[in-house]
Interface confidence: low
């Protein structure tokens, strides 16, 4: 005999107490797949969480973080405090990046400046707490007689692609 529960669509549950009838999920619950015997309770976005997508009968609510916080983990399971650019979050709160490191985002850790000399290049623009150094041509390229017809390409900000 075919299991009648398999015919219950998303948004319903198979209620065995009612001879395997598909009952719509009660308010504040959902089933995202067919054939479910229970509906799951909707996630509530409270405190540092705010609602990005309301719960429906077929899909759970989705949360974001309130202003000043950012999501961490799968499906924004945690909210972490934002810091300013040039800072990183430590156990004692937001701290400025140490000399020789930078962070160009409101999250994450401070990273060391690029070592231009490893690529045989020179520092064109010094690094800051918020920005990495910009490497320019190698010192040899800048010696007298070297062609300077094409200036170095302007540095792109991280995350930006060429137009």
């Amino acid at each position: 005999l075919q299991d009648l529960c398999s015919n219950c669509p998303a948004g319903t549950f198979c209620d065995n107490n009612r001879s395997q009838i598909c009952s719509p999920c009660p308010p504040n619950s959902f089933s995202s797949a067919g054939g479910q015997r229970t509906c799951d309770i909707c996630r509530q976005c409270k405190g540092v969480f705010k609602t990005r997508k309301e719960c429906s009968s077929t899909s759970n609510a989705e949360c974001d973080c309130i202003s000043g916080y950012h999501c961490l983990g799968a499906e924004c399971s945690m909210c972490e405090q934002d810091c300013k650019q040039g800072q990183e979050l430590t156990k004692k709160g937001c701290k400025d990046c140490c000399f020789g490191t930078f962070n160009d985002q409101k999250r994450g850790i401070c990273r060391p400046w690029t070592n231009c000399s490893l690529d045989g290049k020179s520092v064109l623009v010094n690094g800051t707490k918020e920005r990495d150094v910009v490497c320019g041509p190698s010192p040899a390229d800048l010696s007298p007689g070297a062609s300077s017809a094409t200036p170095p390409a302007p540095a792109r900000e991280p995350g930006h692609s060429p137009q």
């Epitope: 948004g11 598909c22 009952s23 719509p24 997508k53 309301e54 429906s56 009968s57 077929t58």
Partner: antibody, heavy 116, light 107 residues
Framework: QVQLQQPGAELVKPGASVKLSCKAS????????INWVKQRPGQGLEWIGN????????NYNERFKTKATLTVDISSSTAYMRLSSLTSEDSAVYYC?????????WGQGTTLTVSS | DILLTQSPAILSVSPGERVSFSCRAS??????IQWYQQRTNGSPRLLIK???ESLSGIPSRFSGSGSGTDFTLSINNVESEDIADYYC?????????FGSGTKLEIK
């Protein structure tokens, strides 16, 4: 405010197909089911099926499974119902209505006339 | 499919009276019943959800009751603007079904 806009009337020849529209406004389109309901002149209401724009999941009344096809266009917040192989029995007012259980907002209905 | 039987087909009352509409389901459906009003040439309007929950914007003279298989829509102090067809609808299982409707007339 919530609104569901439907064209007033459609005239189609027997054997042809028609695509009825229902443009939603005043709420988040992807968060609510859109239902379609048929009403023949002087008759009661008949549920055709529904679609959830958030994941395009559909449920159909078995009687309409080969007759109706439900789709949505998220970019324009519009739901569509395509009716195929039309006969005089398909002449009716077709309503779209928002809601998962209680149908809380209804369009004005499209009067479909199937006639040669 | 769940069959909803509405009775009577026509109800005739005088203004100011109380009127009750009946809806009987072919199987136990808890409280998953809605009631709609449809005036002549108009779209249906949701009056009551989950058998007895009232909705904002609906006059308080409309009320619903019942569970299991027997449900009732009542209107206190009927007014002339209540002339319409009244339908029950179940949301217990697919496909959703409507009753055949009861027409309210004013004497």
């Amino acid at each position: 405010q919530v609104q569901l806009q439907q064209p007033g009337a459609e005239l189609v020849k027997p054997g042809a197909s028609v695509k009825l529209s229902c443009k939603a406004s005043g709420y988040t389109f992807t968060n609510f089911w859109i239902n379609w309901v048929k009403q023949r002149p002087g008759q009661g209401l008949e549920w055709i099926g529904n679609i959830y724009p958030g994941n395009t999941g559909t449920n159909y009344n078995e009687r309409f499974k080969t007759k109706a096809t439900l789709t949505v266009d998220i970019s324009s917040s519009t739901a569509y119902m395509r009716l195929s192989s039309l006969t005089s029995e398909d002449s009716a007012v077709y309503y779209c209505a928002r809601g998962q259980l209680g149908l809380d907002y209804w369009g004005q209905g499209t009067t479909l006339t199937v006639s040669s | 499919d769940i069959l909803l039987t509405q009775s009577p087909a026509i109800l005739s009352v005088s203004p100011g009276e109380r009127v009750s509409f009946s809806c009987r389901a072919s199987q136990i459906i808890g409280t998953t019943i809605q009631w709609y009003q449809q005036r002549t040439n108009g779209s249906p309007r949701l009056l009551i959800k989950y058998a007895s929950e009232s909705l904002s914007g609906i006059p308080s003279r409309f009320s619903g009751s019942g569970s299991g298989t027997d449900f009732t829509l009542s209107i206190n102090n009927v007014e002339s603007e209540d002339i319409a067809d009244y339908y029950c609808q179940q949301s217990h299982s697919w496909p959703f079904t409507f009753g055949s409707g009861t027409k309210l007339e004013i004497k």
